[in-house]
């Protein structure tokens, strides 16, 4: 005798998150009178999808009118599939009893679940970092599934090869992540570099997610020193200027010192931006040279973004005659400030 | 679809007596087939639903009072010893209740039994 | 065993009246919903009208109409015809399969 089937003609159904899963199912035959249940997963953990019989399942709609008279189709459609949804669902026949006992078992549909990775994040290292060092950067893309994905490293548009990629977990899952770590390594011009992060995945229609790090948030570019004496200003005023060129980021601070003593500091306020995203400062100094006896030590002192300070000195003779100083010309004065010393 | 009864007649107590039920234009491997019974001046009352082999049932007070069987295109209802209380029309069919109710019925056939 | 109390045992109505039979279950049928109401007249096979407690059958008038849930149940005729003269019984269904018991039946008279 031909006895009730229970069909589920699809072994495997992908569905992207967001849309609804239709798993088909029907059976061949009315009898045994009994409830069509819908599970995920197999043996006594198994997790009740639908159940004909009773029960609120929000998300689930039948394909066909379940109660119509000699309905044979118990497809089901799960509506906002996500990653979590994954699995295998049977379709089972139950036979109406005190308890309902089960009485034949569709072989199951797999529903895979393809899920987009988030936005890549892309974070450099905590503290910055000179040039021709090596620094880190890692990526991190989440929630994504199935699990094939590749990822891509650039700077300015060129691809970087010293990277290392993990995808997590190795087993199945519902959804996994990546996480790469590249080592990029820093020259002076890098203000205005960026660093791309880009991913790849089946869900992205081959329209890739980008995560980018500018390296003006990595990179610490010092400054280079010189201090130079101007033309006489005025008879018995000798002009010096510290030239503060190709640093960054901007915050720095000035200390003259005048043999050793602290003579004034002052924080760098209207800088210059040169086109590789560094910055140039001057400051200068009216010595009135009258006041002085001996030879005068007149010292640049820079301390930048936190760093050492450095410095830069320049020995200024009194017993020659101001006119005779040094003729050098500052190529810059734009943000000078002067001040004198009496 | 439609389902028509035979074999009622007189019989007297306890001389077996089987009833078939003919189906046409559905599978009997996908409906059971249900018989109900109405004795004179008294109202319907289930006797029992014959599917497969396994899936045959009888209400408890019709068990051991009845057996059912079927081929591909008819179903066997067997009063195996009437009673005076058996006198009734029997109708069959289609359905096995709950989502899949009885319908269509047969026309009836009556079976009275007296000595 | 489920017992099905079904009331009024008769019950008359004018033609565009409204009739109503009530069925009442020793306990809750199967699923809450294992019930349905059939027609029937002398000398003809009972009808199906309503499954699954208020499921209406195919080809059958919108004036029938069936509610309840557990062990209420009932059927409402509104808008009652000549030809809706008849008895009309409930069919419940207990937990197990062949637990499946007719009510007593209400007959129906237009006058």
């Known amino acids: 005798e031909e006895e009730l089937q229970v069909i589920q003609p699809d072994k495997s159904v992908s569905v992207a998150a967001g849309e609804s899963a239709i798993l088909h199912c029907t059976v061949t035959s009315l009898i045994p009178v009994g409830p069509i249940q819908w599970f995920r997963g197999a043996g006594p953990a198994r997790e009740l999808i639908y159940n004909q019989k009773e029960g609120h399942f929000p998300r689930v709609t039948t394909v066909s009118e379940s109660t119509k008279r000699e309905n044979m189709d118990f497809s089901i459609s799960i509506s906002n599939i996500t990653p979590a949804d994954a699995g295998t669902y049977y379709c089972v026949k139950f036979r109406k009893g005190s308890p309902d006992t089960e009485f034949k078992s569709g072989a199951g549909t797999e529903l895979s679940v393809r899920a987009k990775p988030s936005a890549p994040v892309v974070s450099g290292p905590a503290a910055r970092a000179t040039p021709q060092h090596t620094v880190s950067f890692t990526c991190e893309s989440h929630g994504f599934s199935p699990r094939d994905i590749t990822l891509k490293w650039f700077k300015n548009g060129n691809e970087l090869s010293d990277f290392q990629t993990n995808v997590d977990p190795v087993g199945e899952s519902v959804s996994y992540s990546i996480h790469s770590t590249a080592k990029v390594v820093l020259t002076r011009e890098d203000v205005h570099s960026q660093v791309i992060c880009e991913v790849a995945h089946v869900t992205l229609q081959g329209d890739p997610l980008r995560g980018t790090a500018n390296l003006s948030e990595t990179i610490r570019v010092p400054p280079t020193l010189e201090v130079t004496q101007q033309p006489v200003r005025a008879e018995n005023q000798v002009n010096v200027t510290c030239q503060v060129r190709k640093f960054y980021p901007q915050r720095l601070q000035l200390t003259w010192l005048e043999n050793g003593n602290v003579s004034r500091t002052e924080t760098a306020s209207t800088v210059t931006e040169n086109k590789d995203g560094t910055y140039n400062w001057m400051s200068w100094l009216l010595v009135n040279v009258s006041a002085h006896r001996d030879d005068v030590k007149l010292t640049c002192q820079v301390e930048h973004d936190g760093q050492p300070a450095v410095s830069k000195s320049h020995d200024l003779k009194v017993s020659a005659h101001p006119k005779e100083q040094g003729s050098n010309t500052a190529a810059e004065n734009t943000g000078s400030n002067e001040r004198n010393i009496y | 679809r439609s389902v028509e009864e035979s074999g009622g007649r007189l019989v007297t107590p306890g001389t077996p007596l089987t009833l078939t039920c003919t189906v046409s234009g559905f599978s009997l491997s996908s409906h059971g087939i249900s018989w109900v019974r109405q004795a004179p001046g008294k109202g319907l009352e289930y006797i029992g639903t014959i599917g497969t082999g396994v899936i045959t049932y009888f209400a408890s007070w019709a068990k051991g009072r009845f057996t059912g069987s079927k081929t591909s295109t008819t179903v066997d209802l067997k009063i195996t010893s009437p009673t005076t209380e058996d006198t009734a029309t029997y109708f069959c069919?289609?359905?096995?209740?709950?989502?899949?109710?009885?319908?269509?019925w047969g026309p009836g056939t009556l079976v009275t039994v007296s000595s | 065993a489920l017992v099905m109390t079904q009331t009024p045992a008769s019950v008359s109505a004018a033609v565009g009246g409204t009739v109503t039979t009530k069925c009442q279950a020793s306990?809750?049928?199967?699923?809450?919903?294992?019930l349905a109401w059939y027609q029937h007249k002398p000398g003809q096979p009972p009808k199906l009208l309503i499954y699954?407690?208020?499921t209406l059958a195919t080809g059958v008038p919108s004036r029938f109409s069936g509610s309840g849930s557990g062990t209420q149940f009932t059927l409402t005729i509104t808008g009652v015809q000549s030809d809706d003269a008849a008895t009309y019984y409930c069919?419940?269904?207990?937990?197990?399969?062949?637990?499946?018991?007719f009510g007593g039946g209400t007959e129906v008279v237009v006058k």
């Open positions: 306990q809750s049928v199967y699923g809450n919903n294992d």
């Open positions: 069919a289609r359905g096995s209740a709950w989502n899949d109710p009885f319908d269509p």
């Open positions: 069919l419940g269904g207990g937990d197990d399969e062949a637990d499946n018991v």
């Open positions: 699954l407690a208020s």
